[in-house]
Interface confidence: medium
């Protein structure tokens, strides 16, 4: 397959509600009509798939109903949001982009976004 450059931010801090958003941008060499975006998590040399979506250019990304990811696309940019994160989910989140159709098939893998998740402190008991 042919290689393609994918850019993503180096570091993102999740919100107190456990939500992290980042942009995944790919340098499309052709006129793809069908793109597949996969988010991979790398922690302790283990790589696991977090979520994946295939979309037609100009349409919304559709993740599975039970996915922790949502996203929107605009041109060669995909805005990804991962929800329900906890401190234990801190790790390197890698954006993988595949130009599925029409040929030629291109594959691009980003360097990863380090997402830091800090569990919120429980509220102290109130006296009143």
């Amino acid at each position: 397959c042919k290689a393609m450059h994918v850019a993503q931010p180096a570091v993102v801090l999740a919100s107190s509600r456990g939500i992290a958003s980042f942009v995944c941008e790919y340098a499309s060499p052709g006129k793809a009509t069908e793109v597949r975006v996969t988010v991979l998590r790398q922690a302790d040399s283990q790589v696991t798939e977090v979520c994946a979506a295939t979309y037609m250019m100009g349409n919304e990304l559709t993740f599975l109903d039970d996915s922790i990811c949502t996203g929107t696309s605009s041109g060669n940019q995909v805005n990804l949001t991962i929800q329900g994160l906890r401190a234990m989910d801190t790790g390197l989140y890698i954006c993988k982009v595949e130009l599925m159709y029409p040929p030629p098939y291109y594959l691009g893998i980003g360097n990863g976004t380090q997402i830091y998740v800090i569990d919120p402190e429980p509220c102290p008991d109130s006296d009143f």
Partner: antibody, heavy 118, light 107 residues
Framework: EVQLVESGGGLVRPGRSLKLSCAAS????????MSWVRQSPEKRLEWVAE????????YHSDTVTGRFTISRDNAKNTLYLEMSSLKSEDTAIYYC???????????WGQGTSVTVSS | DIQMTQTTSSLSASLGDRVTITCRTS??????LNWYQVKPDGTVKLLIY???RLHSGVPSRFSGSGSGTDYSLTISNLEPEDVATYYC?????????FGGGTKLEIK
């Protein structure tokens, strides 16, 4: 030399099942997406299904979705098409094809004939 | 789905002739078009890809051209082994679709 050899065709009753195989040689099978295309008795060509090089993604035409399943075994260099609930309109010569990086279907097998008739 | 129309279903030409087979698409496909040759024995070969690029091993008497929605395959200096049915196919949008074919015979 790229070679694709289909097998498994034959005469089958409507509603029954059949599994086609395609043995690939002469290239690194696991590097290529593969497709099935059929030619009807009226000589029309119709794309049936495609599977990605790793087997992770597959696509089927609307006419066969839910009835046909494309799969592959990269260890055996073999492509499959599992056909169920066969109809008379599925009668055709089924070709296994390789999808090049830059292209669609650059090499085709010799075809295997499937006849669905009572 | 994109519809592919080959208006000439069959044609007859003499050896040495120059023959042109045409194909029209229902949508602009930006040159994502292939031409295939299907011999009477069922053998299928890719001739031309991306509208005008010659596939490896295909004689240079085959050529392709076109843009937008109108495409053509030209065979110059027709030879006996060119007897076959020729199909255009688009791969700009899934699903890939084929024309109805043009059967070429020798006079």
């Amino acid at each position: 030399e790229v070679q694709l050899v289909e097998s498994g065709g034959g005469l089958v009753r409507p509603g029954r099942s059949l599994k086609l195989s395609c043995a690939a040689s002469g290239f690194t099978f696991s590097n290529y997406a593969m497709s099935w295309v059929r030619q009807s008795p009226e000589k029309r060509l119709e794309w049936v299904a495609e599977i990605s090089y790793s087997g992770t993604y597959s696509y089927h035409s609307d006419t066969v979705t839910g009835r046909f399943t494309i799969s592959r075994d990269n260890a055996k260099n073999t492509l499959y098409l599992e056909m169920s609930s066969l109809k008379s309109e599925d009668t055709a010569i089924y070709y296994c094809t390789r999808r090049d990086y830059d292209n669609e279907m650059d090499y085709w097998g010799q075809g295997t004939s499937v006849t669905v008739s009572s | 789905d994109i519809q592919m129309t080959q208006t000439t279903s069959s044609l007859s030409a003499s050896l040495g002739d120059r023959v042109t087979i045409t194909c029209r698409t229902s949508q602009v496909i930006t040159n994502y078009l292939n031409w295939y040759q299907v011999k009477p024995d069922g053998t299928v070969k890719l001739l031309i890809y991306y509208t005008s690029r010659l596939h490896s091993g295909v004689p240079s008497r085959f050529s392709g051209s076109g843009s937008g929605t109108d495409y053509s395959l030209t065979i110059s200096n027709l030879e006996p082994e060119d007897v076959a049915t020729y199909y255009c196919q688009q791969f700009g949008k899934r699903p890939p679709t084929f024309g109805g074919g043009t059967k070429l015979e020798i006079k």
